[in-house]
């Protein structure tokens, strides 16, 4: 009597998530009499996948009619495959009895599931940084299989090279995750810049997924300050202007000080944007020279985006008032601690 063989011809089968998987199994003999059962895995913890005799297996259907006389094909089709279905499937022949006893197992078919990566999510630094500083952006994508995946970083269309990528877990798994961190050096022109994380995977048919982040969320461009005297008016009033230029973000508070005393505080709002995404703002102060006996020290104090205040001072000379319409006079930076610490002294 020829020994019964349980033949699982495919060592492995790969299926896209959502599709159906066909697992083939034939037996070499109709005897001994007894059922075929399908299991995922082997040993005492194996899961019953299909048993023709009994049970409810809504996603599993036999490929051939198992009730047909002399049927030796016990292949099955599993519908709507998910990554959780990955594993090794065994076709097992039992001898009829009470209970049935396991007689022979096929060699097993490993089912791997091709699953698309999730849309990459790019996150930037928690706090803003200024030009010339390096900031990190992180890109994450999950749930893909097989493990092979390609990730690239771009800044304004130019590919970046300073990044580190990890795919987890290291060993064989149902599905995988990728995490990559790119280091980007900021420039003052980066308000409109964008970083792009691009993920390519076999399941995407050459159409990579992209995640983006705007550098506007990561950058702070500190302002340049310039204080000028526009003219001496006939009514002894001096118009002093504080020009705050090329800053980002818009969050800015300007305070005028006369001889160290707060004269006026203003908040920037609804400013027009420069071409490079930065903002400019001009504030002026009228000083009545005749009301002062001594020179007036005017200070334009700017607090930008929660950073320490930057001061620019200007002295209005009271002792000699030139009566003619004078030309603009630029302020001098007075006081050792009042220099624009960002190099924006205009």
């Amino acid at each position: 009597e020829e020994e019964l063989q349980v033949i699982q011809p495919e060592k492995s089968v790969s299926v896209a998530a959502g599709d159906s998987a066909t697992l083939n199994c034939t037996v070499s003999s109709l005897i001994p009499v007894g059922p075929i059962q399908w299991f995922r895995g082997a040993g005492p913890g194996r899961e019953l996948i299909y048993n023709l005799k009994e049970g409810h297996f809504p996603r599993v259907t036999p490929v051939s009619d198992p009730t047909k006389r002399n049927n030796m094909d016990f292949s099955i089709r599993i519908s709507n495959i998910t990554p959780a279905d990955a594993g090794t499937y065994y076709c097992v022949k039992f001898r009829k009895g009470s209970p049935d006893v396991e007689l022979k197992s096929g060699a097993g078919t490993e089912l791997s599931v091709r699953a698309k990566p999730s849309a990459p999510v790019v996150s930037g630094p928690a706090v803003r940084a200024t030009a010339e500083h390096t900031v990190s952006f992180t890109c994450e994508s999950h749930g893909f299989s097989p493990r092979d995946i390609t990730l690239k970083w771009f800044k304004n269309g130019n590919e970046l090279s300073d990044f580190q990528t990890n795919v987890d877990p290291a060993g064989k798994s149902v599905s995988y995750s990728i995490r990559s961190t790119a280091r980007v050096v900021l420039t003052r022109r980066d308000v409109h810049s964008q970083v792009i994380c691009e993920v390519a995977h076999v399941t995407l048919q050459g159409d990579p997924l992209r995640g983006t982040a705007n550098l506007s969320e990561a950058i702070r461009v500190p302002p340049f300050l310039e204080v000028t005297q526009q003219s001496m008016r006939a009514d002894n009033q001096v118009n002093v202007t504080c020009q705050v230029t090329k800053f980002y973000p818009q969050r800015l508070q300007l305070t005028w000080l006369e001889n160290g005393n707060v004269s006026r505080t203003e908040m920037a709002s609804a400013l027009p944007e420069n071409k490079d995404g930065t903002y400019n703002w001009t504030s002026w102060l009228l000083v009545n020279v005749s009301a002062h006996r001594d020179d007036v020290k005017l200070t334009c104090q700017v607090e930008h985006d929660g950073q320490p205040a930057v001061n620019k001072s200007f002295s209005v000379k009271v002792s000699a008032h030139p009566k003619e319409q004078g030309s603009n006079t630029a302020a001098e930076n007075t006081g050792t601690n009042e220099r624009n610490i960002y190099g924006g002294s205009g």
Partner: antibody, heavy 122, light 112 residues
């Protein structure tokens, strides 16, 4: 090359809970059983239990009421918790991988950790 | 539980000579699928156990061919055709048919 590494406290007080973790590197949790085996000083090996990749657990009845084995596939780790320890639980604890591909039984415990010594003492 | 009994308890050996260890189980380890669910392990001094033989007679990867396993049902034997110095340690048989998995008490092999 699959490697297993046990980690956890080397000293546990009597009546407290022993917690050990085994980290699997260089391979997958899938398609294997993950076992805990212990060896008291100068004695033989005792199987404590194992967990399959689908989360099904099997325990030694002599320890069952005190032992819990769990699996964290995302971290490639599995863990052992044993409550109400006594001096008799002092042993070298091994984590190990068990193969299965020939039906109902098992096909050898083919990868072992180096073992971690746990002493139960006050 | 299946009880595993090993003999001898201790086995002094001469390098180059053969050696044999016996393992008996309290019930048959031969399953209806024709596999004998019995493993052999070697634990060298100060080391973790290592798998030598599985399913009664299959040599594990990397195990020298001087090791062989035989037997069926309840009686099993591990043979070393020519003992080498690195073979010293404690040998354990283990049944892998049903839980709880159970080990024999061990056989200590030492050089004479």
């Amino acid at each position: 090359q699959v490697q297993l590494q046990e980690s956890g406290p080397g000293l546990v007080r009597p009546s407290e809970t022993l917690s050990l973790t085994c980290t699997v590197s260089g391979g997958s949790i899938r398609n294997y059983y993950w076992s805990w085996i212990r060896q008291p000083p100068g004695k033989g090996l005792e199987w404590m239990g194992f967990i399959y990749d689908n989360g099904r657990t099997f325990y030694n009845p002599s320890l069952k009421s005190r032992v819990t084995i769990s699996l964290d596939m995302s971290m490639n780790q599995f863990s052992l918790k044993m409550t109400s320890v006594t001096a008799a639980d002092t042993a070298v604890y091994y984590c190990a991988r068990v193969r299965a591909y020939s039906g109902i039984g098992l096909d050898g415990t083919d990868v072992w950790g180096q073992g971690t010594t746990v002493t139960v003492s006050s | 539980d299946i009880v595993m009994t090993q003999s001898p308890l201790s086995l002094p050996v001469t390098p180059g000579e053969p050696a044999s260890i016996s393992c008996k189980s309290s019930q048959s380890l031969l399953y209806s699928n024709a596999y004998n669910y019995l493993d052999w392990y070697l634990q060298r001094p100060g080391q973790s156990p290592q798998l030598l033989i599985y399913l009664g007679s299959n040599r594990a990867s990397g195990v020298p061919d001087r090791f062989s396993g035989s037997g069926s049902g309840t009686d099993f034997t591990l043979k070393i055709s020519r003992v080498e110095a690195e073979d010293v340690g404690v040998y354990y048989c283990m049944q892998a048919l049903q839980t709880p998995l159970t080990f024999g008490g061990g056989t200590k092999v030492e050089i004479k």
